[in-house]
């Protein structure tokens, strides 16, 4: 599949973020892998996500900057090829964004594709 596109971040509460994205084809056979990190981290933290194109991070440290990326594949249970897509562009959010009151809190994209 194509790499996920249009990553957006929403603030659900003071300490909770939701990441949303689009895939070129809406397909219930798709599954996703989200990686996130902060500027304090040495390694990505990873979370598998089902066909729903969203991921919630329930506990956010407002002093740190967070970066997310996502890739997708067809669920092996659907009998399709099991290769992961390329990574999406990264999405970064800072503590200044976290302090804002708007629902959409990150407009900053890295215009660089990431390969696995």
């Amino acid at each position: 599949p194509w790499a996920p596109e249009n990553l957006t971040l929403h603030k659900l509460s003071e300490s909770q973020l939701e990441l949303n994205w689009n895939n070129r084809f809406l397909n219930h056979c798709l599954e996703h892998l989200v990686q996130y990190r902060t500027d304090w981290d040495h390694s990505w933290t990873e979370q598998s996500v089902d066909y729903r194109h969203k991921f919630s991070l329930p506990s956010v440290d407002g002093q740190k900057r967070y970066t997310f990326r996502v890739r997708s594949r067809f669920n092996p249970l659907c009998g399709s090829a099991q290769h992961w897509s390329e990574w999406s562009e990264q999405k970064l959010i800072s503590e200044e964004d976290l302090g804002g009151e708007q629902k959409l809190i990150s407009e900053e994209d890295l215009h660089h594709h990431h390969h696995h």
Epitope: R37, H42, S43, R65, L92, L110, H112
Partner: antibody, heavy 116, light 108 residues
Framework: EVQLVESGGGVVRPGGSLRLSCAAS????????MSWVRQAPGKGLEWISS????????DYADSVKGRFTISRDNAKNSLFLQMSSLRAEDTALYHC?????????WGQGTLVTVSS | DIQMTQSPSSLSASVGDRVTITCRAS??????LNWYQQKPGKAPKLLIY???SLQSGVPSRFSGSGSGTDFTLTISSLQPEDFATYYC??????????FGQGTRLEIK
Amino acid sequence: EVQLVESGGGVVRPGGSLRLSCAASGFTFDDYGMSWVRQAPGKGLEWISSINRNGGSADYADSVKGRFTISRDNAKNSLFLQMSSLRAEDTALYHCASGEFRFDYWGQGTLVTVSS
Amino acid sequence: DIQMTQSPSSLSASVGDRVTITCRASQSISSYLNWYQQKPGKAPKLLIYAASSLQSGVPSRFSGSGSGTDFTLTISSLQPEDFATYYCQQSYSTPPITFGQGTRLEIK
């Protein structure tokens, strides 16, 4: 005490292959993504590859993409770099380092010399 | 790719001096900036991460500051063991991870 010990370097002809290893101890290996960073004689540091905690995701510098493969064995606390189609410009001291993008611990390096 | 430029490339200083090394990114990297020290024949050592956070075990005379494109590493009072080469490294846009070209700190 944290230790990262590289091995497998040597002299190889252009077009040849080598497999580098890094033995880790003194920290919880599978809590860390791992990386290889090289340093040509008298030159600066160049990141070449990183792998995530479980080995499911890897990134490469354009200069080695398609020629080098990073892997790990968490059961043996080991990191590997399979290098093929070696070129003179790959001559360098190869360090393994803990972390995917922030390098907390480093090995002393193993020297790779590509020469005809 | 993001380019990292350090200045100066080399400098001479005396024990007890206050020394500042600067690192400039070719685009904003927020605070995704790390500093390393490397002595001849030795592996690099992480000094500062996230632009200003001191790595465990590193003396407090080392400090980092900056955000966006301009960063500094400051050694408040040089000690004999501080003469080495220092590298900055960005981890904002990855891959690739990129390092500065290094700053060689020599004894005057």
